[in-house]
Structure formats: structure tokens, C-alpha cells
């Protein structure tokens, strides 16, 4: 089990549809070194970072997920379907496995909420 470090993360974050958000898990340890980091949903991988191979972003997210800052991810062009749980997994040596969970709530953009740009009036005549 994990004995030599901690993961800190915001458990709940929100962002606007069409906007972007940073998914970040902060790992701290005096002794363990990170060898690999996974970012995933229940059944979909977002990205993997490994010390030897660097970043690998899953193809389905490659146009919307940018590695960083640090070992986090910047998730862009958010849609309502992106609402849900995201898991970070830090594989470390010799400390073991450390995990974090983030719930992302994607909200309608403020323009939509205010009813702007909903209707276009046709010119008379």
C-alpha cells in the first residue's frame, strides 16, 4: 500500500460549456518518485505520463486535452457530456500507488443562462 506520500486535489470543480478547466492532483512525498501518472474516467483513458515515454494523450481526447501544467491536464472545449468523475493515479517508486478523484460539473455558459443569443429577429420588409 501507499505509505510515503499524499495526493491533494479539489474534489469538485465546475467550468462553463465551451470553456476549459485544469485537472490537477498534487502529489507530495519525501521519498517516493513518480514513475507514471494516469488520468482516466471509469472506462476511458484521457492520458498517461511516464518518465521514460513522456505524455500519451488518448486519441479521442487529443484535440481537447493538453498535458500540463505539471502532471495535470488542461481540458478544453468542454461539453455537458464531460460532466463526471475523473481519476488520477500516481505510480511511484518505492512508495506505491496514490489516487485522487475529481468531480467535474460542466455548466451552461452564462450567455445561455441569461437567454442571450437564443433568438435572432428577422428583418422586416
Amino acid at each position: 500500500g501507499a505509505t510515503a506520500g499524499t495526493i491533494d486535489t479539489k474534489r469538485n470543480i465546475s467550468a462553463e460549456e465551451g470553456g476549459s478547466v485544469i485537472l490537477q492532483c498534487h502529489f507530495s512525498s519525501d521519498t517516493a518518485e513518480v514513475t507514471q501518472v494516469d488520468w482516466k474516467q471509469q472506462d476511458q483513458l484521457l492520458a498517461i505520463y511516464s518518465v521514460d515515454l513522456g505524455w500519451h494523450v488518448a486519441s479521442v481526447f487529443s484535440d481537447r486535452v493538453v498535458p500540463g501544467p505539471s502532471l495535470g491536464l488542461t481540458f478544453q472545449s468542454l461539453t455537458m457530456n464531460d460532466t463526471g468523475e475523473y481519476f488520477c493515479t500516481y505510480h511511484t517508486y518505492p512508495g506505491g500507488i496514490y489516487k485522487g478523484r475529481i468531480f467535474l460539473k460542466v455548466q451552461e455558459s452564462s450567455d445561455d443562462r441569461n437567454g442571450l443569443a437564443q433568438f435572432q429577429t428577422a428583418p422586416l420588409g
Partner: antibody, heavy 119, light 106 residues
Framework: EVQLVESGGDLVQPGRSLKISCVAS????????MAWVRLAPQKGLEWVAS????????HYGDSVRGRFIISRDNPKNILYLQMNSLGSEDTATYFC????????????WGQGTLVIVSS | NIVMAQSPKSMSISAGDRVTMNCKAS??????IAWYQQKPGQSPKLLIF???NRYSGVPDRFTGGGYGTDFTLTIKSVQAEDAAFYYC????????FGSGTKLEIK
């Protein structure tokens, strides 16, 4: 829709070799760690081997290490299991499955292919 | 390597009853456990990951619990279609399965 289809199962004599395959579709194969898991008659599930998304890192269960080789062909979307020095204890249905991340839970499974080792 | 011991080996339960099965790890595995259901002639299905997270689409009568070395899978009101083998699996490092629990419905 994610699909995993195993093939190549056969009746084989003890000491011989066999290579089974799994064709993946409905997702980007090269993004995911993959695994082989087997179910032997009157026994439970046994993890056999897993391989990283790019193929350079492999992991094996104790009972097959040194005899079996897991590999993948990402351009063809195929996962392989080369089984050497087969014994009767290797008789099982072999399932191909997809990890979500690194060596974690298995959401998607194939229907299995039967390997029988007998003289 | 860590060994996953499941108990009981089999159980026979009436529909509507509550059932709990156990999985014990030989060493601390934190919450790095998944549970699967497998019916004869079918592929296994993921029920629970990280010991207590229900996979999407899994009925809420299935609940996972535990941490460290002792884990449980509870079915709060067993249905006829729940007759199956249930396996725990240690995830990461060496993804070992337990020996399984067979659930029969009376």
C-alpha cells in the same frame, strides 16, 4: 461500440506451442493497456498477462512467466498470446480484455477462445 | 505476491435476501480492488472498482466496501439473475483474482 474477438484456440498436445489472437475494434487500440485472463474448468479467473499501450512493457502471472509472451500489433489492432511448453494446467478459456489505465480494472472483455492441452 | 482469499466458496440464498461475500488480501492493498460477476458461458462483467465505486449501469443493490486487507461485496436484495460467480481482483502491480464465490438462488 467496443469489441474484442479472440481466435486461435485449439486442441494441442502437451509440450507444444500455440498462438492465440484478439482483434479489437470500436476504440483506438494503441491508447490502452490490454490483458489476457483465463478461466480453467472447475477453477476461477486467473490473470495471465498484460501489455502497455505501446507494447514495450509486459507483465506476467507467476504460472506463465517464462513460457508465455504477450505482444501487440497496434497498426492491425491485434493482441497476441504466444503460449509455449503447454501443459494440461493451461487448459482454459482465454479472454482478451481492456484495462482503463495501467494494470487496473477490466471493463471490456471478449467472448473467449478455448485452449485444450491433451494428448 | 499478494494472495486474495474469497469466502465463502459458495452460498445458496433466497430471492429478496441480503447477501455479503468477503475478500481478504494477504497484505494491505488500500482500496485497489475490483469486483466482477461472471455467469456460465459469459464474459466477466465489472461491478465495482476502487473497492466501493459502482461501475456505471450496475444496479444499486450491489455495494462494495472495505479498505486495507478486508473487503466485502453486498447484494441487498438478491434477484434470480444474480446467480453467478463473483470474483475480487487486486488491481495494479500484479492484478491477482480471488478464487471466487458461487452464488446460487434457492
Amino acid at each position: 461500440e467496443v469489441q474484442l474477438v479472440e481466435s486461435g484456440g485449439d486442441l494441442v498436445q502437451p509440450g507444444r506451442s500455440l498462438k492465440i489472437s484478439c482483434v479489437a475494434s470500436g476504440f483506438t487500440f494503441s491508447d490502452y493497456y490490454m490483458a489476457w485472463v483465463r478461466l480453467a474448468p472447475q477453477k476461477g479467473l486467473e490473470w495471465v498477462a498484460s501489455i502497455s499501450y505501446e507494447g514495450s512493457r509486459t507483465h506476467y502471472g507467476d504460472s506463465v512467466r517464462g513460457r508465455f509472451i504477450i505482444s501487440r500489433d497496434n497498426p492491425k489492432n491485434i493482441l497476441y498470446l504466444q503460449m509455449n511448453s503447454l501443459g494440461s494446467e493451461d487448459t482454459a478459456t482465454y479472454f482478451c480484455a481492456r484495462h482503463t489505465g495501467t494494470l487496473d480494472w477490466l471493463v471490456y472483455w471478449g467472448q473467449g477462445t478455448l485452449v485444450i492441452v491433451s494428448s | 505476491n499478494i494472495v486474495m482469499a474469497q469466502s465463502p466458496k459458495s452460498m445458496s440464498i433466497s430471492a429478496g435476501d441480503r447477501v455479503t461475500m468477503n475478500c481478504k488480501a494477504s497484505q494491505n492493498v488500500d482500496n485497489n480492488i475490483a469486483w466482477y460477476q461472471q455467469k456460465p458461458g459469459q464474459s466477466p462483467k465489472l461491478l465495482i472498482f476502487y473497492a466501493s465505486n459502482r461501475y456505471s449501469g450496475v444496479p444499486d443493490r450491489f455495494t462494495g466496501g472495505g479498505y486495507g486487507t478486508d473487503f466485502t461485496l453486498t447484494i441487498k436484495s438478491v434477484q434470480a439473475e444474480d446467480a453467478a460467480f463473483y470474483y475480487c481482483q487486486r488491481i495494479y502491480n500484479f492484478p491477482t483474482f480471488g478464487s471466487g464465490t458461487k452464488l446460487e438462488i434457492k
